[in-house]
Interface confidence: low
Amino acid sequence: FNLSYPITPWRFKLSCMPPNSTYDYFLLPAGLSKNTSNSNGHYETAVEPKFNSSGTHFSNLSKTTFHCCFRSEQDRNCSLCADNIEGKTFVSTVNSLVFQQIDANWNIQCWLKGDLKLFICYVESLFKNLFRNYNYKVHLLYVLPEVLEDSPLVPQKGSFQMVHCNCSVHECCECLVPVPTAKLNDTLLMCLKITSGGVIFQSPLMSVQPINMVKPDPPLGLHMEITDDGNLKISWSSPPLVPFPLQYQVKYSENSTTVIREADKIVSATSLLVDSILPGSSYEVQVRGKRLDGPGIWSDWSTPRVFTTQDVIYFPPK
């Protein structure tokens, strides 16, 4: 029985619940359905308290305490992150009138870089209006329990380490978590604390196995050529330093005077043959990679490459 929320490489939602309220108090952002997936394969967290209030200045706001929980259809319980020092419960203290017609949203994406050297979390503020007015700090608290079975509940007080996330890029913060290579298979427990102008959001405890969150670098050396039998061969190289085999998703569009065709294929090789190509057409291609034999996160797409076939295709090519 573990009170932490398991992070998996797909979208999940974080809701901040005021006292004596139910989850029905919260709404998904406009246009977003409960099972929306992120097109780039990352999971995302949206922190979204919604409030109706009359116009009130920031200076005279009273504080309300919020528990931030991950929303799940099956289980509406959530664990609270024990404070790294004093052992007090991590709760979210937010100013309930600050959010006039604003949704407080964050996209949170974490992954282990493809060379297995660095675990990164990005916290992107979608709460633009407030963060323009206030400096904000983001901390990530984490612990790698020596043997998780010995302490299956929230880690004891004083066990957390804290890293200051680098928010030098406006509205996006980078948190670097030092995870030794020998512990990549272990369970990393972590939580986020976001502070802005006296407003504090703190996530519940999250758990992740870094090895299951590997995000490779994009494939390299994407190029195209016409084969002897008149097919289009798309080739690329695996990114360097990836210590396991990858699967690849290739997406391409064919644009000719008569037709526009789009397709994407999943392959385990580093090349793909496209048949029935048309003379005088342009092909725009991108490829991305993901761990083949286990869970993981798709890499970013490679830079698009465009290949234009000749008006006449010779067999064999001249």
Epitope: I85, L118, K137, M162, V163, N166, S168, C173, L176, P178
Partner: antibody, heavy 120, light 108 residues
Framework: EVQLVESGGGLVQPGGSLRLSCVAS????????MHWVRQTTGKGLEWVSG???????YYPGSVKGRFTISRENAENSLYLQMNGLRVGDTAVYYC??????????????WGQGTMVTVSS | DIQMTQSPSSLSASVGDRVTITCRAS??????LNWYQQKPGKAPKLLIY???SLQSGVPSRFSGSGSGTDFTLTISSLQPEDFATYYC??????????FGQGTRLEIK
Amino acid sequence: EVQLVESGGGLVQPGGSLRLSCVASGFTFNKYDMHWVRQTTGKGLEWVSGIDTDGDTYYPGSVKGRFTISRENAENSLYLQMNGLRVGDTAVYYCARWPWSGFYGAFDIWGQGTMVTVSS
Amino acid sequence: DIQMTQSPSSLSASVGDRVTITCRASQSISSYLNWYQQKPGKAPKLLIYAASSLQSGVPSRFSGSGSGTDFTLTISSLQPEDFATYYCQQSYSTPPITFGQGTRLEIK
């Protein structure tokens, strides 16, 4: 002028208690994280405790449970309550300000220090 | 905890010399490193923050560089008032905030 002035140091027996104070002037005290750092004679610097603008407190293992940091923003004052003092706690204690420059913290303003001697 | 190791622990130099002090972290700390100067009987003074940013009022002969685990403080041309003890300090993974053991810079 931005300034931090410590007081409250002195001679105390092992197991005794002492309360250090730090008065800030020349800046908006409640906007800054504040810390205590100590330096034993002829030795290096050791961080002792910190308190952020939210009132959350931070300690290293060597003093946790014995020292308590607090702040009184209305009085521009920082405090360090030291209980169960040990001979190894003998040091000059500095009060220091910790602003955030972007997201990089540093001790940019220090007090002159107050001497704490623990001896029987 | 992240350990900070400075080298050398002491060095002698002359006015006008170029001096380099190094600081190594036991694990990557990105660029969350600060440098301080302390003269006898005085409080430390912040020289460099975020590895390479010069604190306001600090002479430009002081510079910092490095990222990850290895960092350097350089004094391009030593002045008489620069003879002091220098400390590095990490603010990446806290608590605790940790300092190097110090480098004492003496007149040759």
